[in-house]
Interface confidence: medium
């Protein structure tokens, strides 16, 4: 095996080109200069190296950059990125959105891998906040990205970035995440007129408080049932039948189909039955006429 460590005569690589695909692993190790590889990283992705050959190239780069690859190399990694471990990526300092896009492209069509998650984490931490361009890029590649962040991480999203969020980006968000995002969306869209505002804010309403829902009910917004079903139960409960009727408009008829599901079920239990009857939907389970309704939350606050 000792003689294999020397590069055979005439095989020393003078450029990164297609001829290298015919090199055995040990020849790549012996004949490709690490600095040459680093200078010509933009060529690697155009050459159909095997996974074993990519392992050798990665090893060379690891030796050249023990503290982590520079961005000039990272942006040209291409399929070599798939060979990187989260530990490798934690050594990187990625600041260019173009670099991020190039690497996300390599992983396109696959679920978010630990490598990609680490890369995104490094990138966002390096930027200090999740700006609009970054959010645009990340949600384009991973529509569920936003909902994969913790409420604490979401708190670094500036309101201006909310413009990049599409309804499908929020599909998997839980109420805690929407609690953080909703005030940012409200701020971002505050200068829009009623109908336009509602179109934009609709996806975020799972984080809306009661008073905002009451305000929306005065604006003829005609909220669909799907949106209503995603509202916070505690925000829906204080709404009156009249307010819910105004909020839903023609969609109010859909309450019947959802009467066994939260938040509709819990809301029905809080309403007077004769108020519910005014809707003419046959909703049952309200407070019978003649019963006294105590607001226990107010009683707790006073004691």
């Amino acid at each position: 095996e000792v003689e294999k460590t020397a590069c055979p005569s005439g095989k020393k690589a003078r450029e990164i080109d297609e001829s290298l695909i015919f090199y055995k692993k040990w020849e790549l190790e012996a004949c490709v200069d690490a600095a040459l590889l680093a200078t010509q990283m933009d060529r690697v992705n155009a050459i159909p190296f095997t996974y074993e050959q990519l392992d050798v190239l990665k090893h060379k780069l690891d030796e050249l950059y023990p503290q982590g690859y520079p961005e000039s190399v990272i942006q040209h990694l291409g399929y070599l990125f798939l060979k990187m471990s989260p530990e490798d990526i934690r050594k990187w300092n990625v600041t260019s959105l173009e670099t991020l896009k190039a690497l996300l492209e390599v992983n396109k069509g696959h679920e978010m891998s630990p490598q990609v998650a680490t890369l995104i984490d490094r990138f966002v931490k390096g930027r200090g906040q999740l700006d609009k361009d970054t959010l645009d890029t990340l949600t384009a590649f991973y529509p569920g990205y936003l909902c994969s962040l913790s409420p604490e991480e979401l708190s670094s999203v500036p309101p201006s970035s909310i413009w990049a969020v599409r309804p499908q980006d929020l599909d998997t968000c839980d109420p805690r995440q929407l609690d953080v995002l909703y005030p940012k969306a409200r701020l971002a869209f505050q200068n829009m007129n009623g109908s336009e505002y509602f179109v934009k804010i609709q996806s975020f309403l799972g984080g809306a408080p009661t008073e905002d829902l009451k305000a929306l009910s005065q604006q003829n917004v005609s909220m669909d049932l799907a949106t209503f079903m995603k509202l916070r139960t505690d925000a829906v409960l204080p709404l009156t039948v009249a307010e819910v009727q105004k909020l839903l408009g023609p969609h109010v008829e859909g309450l019947k189909a959802e009467e066994r599901h939260r938040p509709v079920r819990d809301w029905i239990l809080r309403q007077r039955q004769d108020d519910l009857d005014t809707l003419g939907l046959g909703l049952q389970g309200g407070i019978p006429n003649g019963y006294l309704v105590l607001d226990l939350s107010m009683q707790e606050a006073l004691s």
Epitope: R14, E15, E18, D33, A35, T39, Q40, M41, S72, V73
Partner: antibody
Framework: QVQLQESGPGLVKPSQTLSLTCTVS??????????WSWIRQHPGKGLEWIGY???????YYNPSLKSRVTISVDTSKNQFSLKLSSVTAADTAVYYC???????????WGQGTLVTVSS | DIVMTQTPLSLSVAPGQPASISCQSS???????????LYWYLQKPGQPPQLLIY???NRFSGVPDRFSGSGSGTDFTLKISRVEAEDVGIYYC?????????FGQGTKLEIK
């Protein structure tokens, strides 16, 4: 603005070793993706690339000079150096240091220093 | 090694007139990644060379738009649409496709 400045003796005796240093200012020699090169120009002639070094110490030398060339780097001083052994009159030239950006293009050059090989 | 050959070796042009320099490489400078590694430098009298054009046709920052590059494979051209007095010097083409990187022998531009 990155600046490079060559320094070293202007006169070297035949068979001795030519030694030059390039000091980089206005930027780090450990900068991302930059390789540091030496190029020479014989009087009234064209340019000849000698070789490059990366801050990690990895080098590549022009095969025509490889047996006589050593390029080294001192990141603490932001300098890199050239040593050319067994010089002859044919090594008389203006020696330039330059930054090889992204591995392909020389974007910053020193002013050059004339080294004469003569007894 | 890749050999770079420039023509003409010298030319004299009146101010405001166009100028054209050719460069031929002994091997194609195009890589399968689509890039072509051909560069143009200008060395003004008493100065180090300065980068004009990278990857055949891209002007380096600060380079006037009267300079343009074209070509592919092994044949390349640098054009100056209207020569000015400050354009005098020696023009070099350079390849960085393959080590060792190499320069053409230079084309000296003078003003008539």
């Amino acid at each position: 603005q990155v600046q490079l400045q060559e320094s070293g003796p202007g006169l070297v005796k035949p068979s001795q070793t030519l030694s030059l240093t390039c000091t980089v200012s206005g930027g780090s020699i450990s900068g991302d993706g930059h390789f540091w090169s030496w190029i020479r120009q014989h009087p009234g002639k064209g340019l000849e690339w000698i070789g490059y070094i990366y801050y990690s110490g990895s080098t590549y030398y022009n095969p025509s000079l490889k047996s006589r060339v050593t390029i080294s780097v001192d990141t603490s001083k932001n300098q890199f150096s050239l040593k050319l052994s067994s010089v002859t009159a044919a090594d008389t030239a203006v020696y330039y240091c330059a930054r090889l950006r992204g591995g392909y293009k020389f974007d910053y050059w020193g002013q050059g220093t004339l080294v004469t090989v003569s007894s | 090694d890749i050999v770079m050959t420039q023509t003409p070796l010298s030319l004299s042009v009146a101010p405001g007139q166009p100028a054209s320099i050719s460069c031929q490489s002994s091997l194609s400078l195009q890589h399968s990644n689509g890039k072509t590694y051909l560069y143009w430098y200008l060395q003004k009298p008493g100065q180090p060379p300065q980068l004009l054009i990278y990857e055949v046709s891209n002007r380096f920052s600060g380079v006037p738009d009267r300079f343009s590059g074209s070509g592919s494979g092994t044949d390349f051209t640098l054009k100056i649409s209207r020569v000015e007095a400050e354009d005098v010097g020696i023009y070099y083409c350079m390849q960085s496709k393959q080590l060792p990187y190499s320069f053409g022998q230079g084309t000296k531009l003078e003003i008539k």
